[in-house]
Interface confidence: low
């Protein structure tokens, strides 16, 4: 009686179980009563990453330098190429199809989370008592100078973009 299901790494065709092609190889012809499944290795720029019955291998991903991409890991006949972003850029999505520059946090904003290859700089507004006077992809909001600890007084209040200005205390004669 012909089988209705096949073992792992086999597939059912014409009422018989044929072996699947191993990763890195594509199907050329199905097995018959007398012959084994015929498989061929994928070419240099192609891959198949599973046991399969595909008649075509998949093209390796192209890491397009115009999109800010470079090869992180070269593909093999069994694995796809992995792209990553050039220095100073991060992926626009999980699939990393193109890259954008890490953004800088403007004055008045500090870095909450530094950018990585896959996520952008996250900025936060400087709260009261903190400031940032630079546009930076690295600097956090800095606390206002404490004039008291230097035996000075505040001559000019700080803002989210400027530090306080300290000055000498008026001496009472």
């Amino acid at each position: 009686e012909p089988p209705t299901a096949c073992r792992e790494k086999q597939y059912l065709i014409n009422s018989q179980c044929c072996s699947l092609c191993q990763p890195g190889q594509k199907l050329v012809s199905d097995c018959t009563e007398f012959t084994e499944t015929e498989c061929l290795p994928c070419s240099e720029s192609e891959f198949l990453d599973t046991w399969n019955r595909e008649t075509r291998c998949h093209q390796h991903k192209y890491c397009d330098p115009n999109l800010g991409l470079r090869v992180q890991q070269k593909g093999t006949s069994e694995t796809d190429t992995i792209c990553t972003c050039e220095e100073g850029l991060h992926c626009m999505s999980e699939s990393c199809e193109s890259c954008v520059p890490h953004r800088s946090c403007l004055p008045g904003f500090g870095v909450k989370q530094i950018a990585t290859g896959v996520s952008d700089t996250i900025c936060e507004p400087c709260p009261v008592g903190f400031f940032s006077n630079v546009s930076s992809a690295f600097e956090k909001c800095r606390p206002w100078t404490s004039c008291e600890t230097k035996d000075l007084v505040v001559q000019q209040a700080g803002t989210n973009k400027t530090d306080v200005v300290c000055g000498p205390q008026d001496r009472q004669r």
């Epitope: 626009m92 999980e94 699939s95 890259c99 954008v100 403007l106 904003f109």
Partner: antibody, heavy 120, light 107 residues
């Protein structure tokens, strides 16, 4: 204050194409992704795609692939969305949206919208 | 694609009351969710990004929470200007997808 100013309303016949522009004031687009989102009457917002002004790289919603083209003119700080082979169900308000401080996908700044009506 | 489902479709609330809006993702989107407010004839306005970070200039009565597949937008004390439609957006993977919206109306 960042502003995105879009081109005016359009009326098109089925099968035609429409090109909507989106001009940024105050800052250059470079480094900030520009998303395009549409909203048919009474419907949810629908993301169409985005363009990376830094590289010109685009990512499209497969639903629109082949019909939508996003481009950018960095020197004019203007982004464009062209939709071809228009059908009646493309009648919608089309928005451009850009991110400034927060995150490249969660757009902070939006254009006022451009109504595109497709009717024979 | 990831489907974002918002509930309820309509929420009737009195001014000064608390409103809780829910958004569920069909798969894990980590904390990559944003919330938008939209009033008739206007473009959407970003309120919350990365699930819980309030955009600069947004009043403290708006707060976001959640991660993975379940997210919440809370408006602690509704003001007259808060009556609008609210959308969640997942920005974890392409295509970016919005929920169908929750209309917050005056009770």
């Amino acid at each position: 204050q960042v502003q995105l100013v879009q081109s005016g309303a359009e009326v098109k016949k089925p099968g035609a194409s429409v090109k909507v522009s989106c001009k940024a004031s105050v800052y250059s687009f470079t480094g900030y992704t520009v998303n395009w989102v549409r909203q048919a009457p009474g419907q949810r917002l629908e993301w169409m795609g985005l363009i990376n002004p830094y590289t010109g790289g685009t990512t499209y919603n497969q639903k629109f692939k082949g019909r939508v083209t996003l481009t950018i003119d960095k020197s004019a700080s203007t982004a464009y969305m062209e939709l071809s082979s228009l059908r009646s169900e493309d009648t919608a308000v089309y928005y451009c949206a850009s991110s400034y401080y927060s995150n490249p996908y969660a757009s902070d700044y939006w254009g006022q919208g451009t109504l595109v009506t497709v009717s024979s | 694609e990831i489907v974002m489902t918002q509930s309820p479709a309509t929420l009737s609330v009195s001014p000064g009351e608390r409103a809780t809006l829910s958004c569920k993702a069909s798969q894990n989107v980590h904390t990559r969710v944003a919330w938008y407010q939209q009033k008739p004839g206007q473009a959407p306005r970003l309120l919350i990004y990365l699930a819980s970070d309030r955009r600069t200039g947004i009043p403290a009565r708006f707060s976001g929470s959640g991660s993975g597949t379940e997210f919440t937008l809370t408006i602690s004390s509704l003001q007259s200007e808060d009556f609008a439609v609210y959308y969640c957006l997942q920005h974890w993977t392409y295509p970016l997808t919005f929920g169908q919206g929750t209309k917050v109306e005056i009770k």
